[in-house]
């Protein structure tokens, strides 16, 4: 199997009261909004052949996605929750830039392509989905990286 | 509509093993799981385990690991669960439930499968 | 496992009040607890889902709160059908566990 390398994040992140419960407010608000309950993008498909150890590059990727193409995008939405949200996750992300697998992750990317391309067939809509599901976004982040 | 339809009610004697089975109808069955739940008579509920319809996937409550097997059979959309080396105390309803995955609530039940383990 | 306990264990109140039951978790499970309500010989029917999403049917006098230990499931105006045994579920690990219950009893 693949060996990831600097695939942790400490647990203190996962802890801290204030900016974990305005992380799950955001996405209880865009789950409000989500009409489409019988999409999951976070789930067993999602991490399907995906070993224990590379979970946390598989969330890794998964995490910048988010970032990039729809919490930066949708920026302006459900505040006061994204502007405290997005840079915490962000800091999230930088500090798993150094995370890595040597060997194949073909298995990791097609699945992650699948979640991606769920996305973006839903649209807007497939947007607001990933936002309502930042909850299971950040307690997979957490059971896979620490 | 969705719905989930468990197998009839069991006698079985101590030491025996019994499997119930659990018919999903009215939804995708492999975008759920399936977990499983007991009520003893008179009792509250337990939690038992939890299938993945899509991967087969389980993980079991530690007090019934070794003697528990949950499966799917996704070409009938059933589930199963097959509990080993019966004793009297695992005299139960014994309840299938719809579970969207990770971290969710069970949104839809089986009406319930009563074991009666009795020598 | 987490261990989920609920207060009261028994409930006596009338048609019209207000009622409120406790549910703490024996650490933090964030907001993954559901409230189920069971009648006898009936299977149970989840209320409220993620400590306070009303489930789809669930009638909207039912309210749920709290995050992270602490967590109470409300019935604004107690009806007659409301008299049943209410169970919360922590789902903040992968083994999920169950509050021993509440039976809410006409006084």
């Known amino acids: 199997a693949p060996i990831s390398s600097h695939c942790r994040l400490d647990k203190s992140n996962f802890q801290q009261p204030y900016i974990t419960n305005r992380t799950f407010m955001l996405a209880k608000e865009a789950s409000l909004a989500d009409n489409n309950t019988d999409v999951r993008l976070i789930g067993e498909k999602l991490f399907h052949g995906v070993s224990m150890s590379e979970r946390c590059y598989l969330m890794k990727q998964v995490l910048n996605f988010t970032l990039e193409e729809v919490l930066f995008p949708q920026s302006d939405r459900f505040q006061p929750y994204m502007q405290e949200v997005v840079p915490f996750l962000a800091r999230l992300s930088n500090r798993l830039s150094t995370c890595h697998i040597e060997g194949d992750d073909l298995h990791i990317q097609r699945n992650v392509q699948k979640l991606k391309d769920t996305v973006k067939k839903l649209g807007e809509s497939g947007e607001i989905k990933a936002i309502g599901e930042l909850d299971l976004l950040f307690m997979s982040l957490r059971n896979a990286c620490i | 509509q969705v719905q989930l339809v468990e197998s009839g009610a069991e006698v079985k004697k101590p030491g025996a093993s019994v499997k119930v089975s659990c018919k999903a109808s009215?939804?995708?069955?492999?975008?759920?799981?399936i977990s499983w739940v007991r009520q003893a008579p008179g009792q509250g509920l337990e939690w038992m385990g939890w299938?993945?319809?899509?991967?087969?996937?389980?993980n079991y409550a530690q007090k019934f690991q070794g003697r528990v097997t949950m499966t799917t059979d996704t070409s009938t959309s059933t589930a199963y669960m097959e509990l080993r080396g019966l004793r009297s105390d695992d005299t139960a309803v014994y309840y299938c439930a719809r579970d969207r995955g990770y971290y969710d609530a069970y949104d839809i039940w089986g009406q319930g499968t009563l074991v009666t383990v009795s020598s | 496992d987490i261990q989920m306990t609920q207060s009261p264990s028994t409930l006596s109140a009338s048609i019209g009040d207000r009622v409120t039951i406790t549910c703490r978790a024996s650490?933090?499970?964030y907001h993954w607890l559901a409230w189920y309500q069971q009648k006898p010989g009936k299977a149970p029917k989840l209320l409220i889902y993620k400590a306070s999403s009303l489930a789809s049917g669930a009638p909207s006098r039912f309210s749920g709160s709290g995050f992270g230990t602490d967590f109470t499931l409300t019935i604004s105006s107690l009806q007659p059908d409301d008299f049943a045994t209410y169970y919360c579920q922590q789902m903040g690990e992968y083994n999920a566990t169950i509050g021993g219950g509440t039976k809410l009893e006409i006084k």
């Open positions: 009215g939804y995708t069955f492999t975008s759920y799981g």
């Open positions: 650490e933090g499970i």
């Open positions: 299938v993945s319809a899509y991967t087969g996937n389980t």
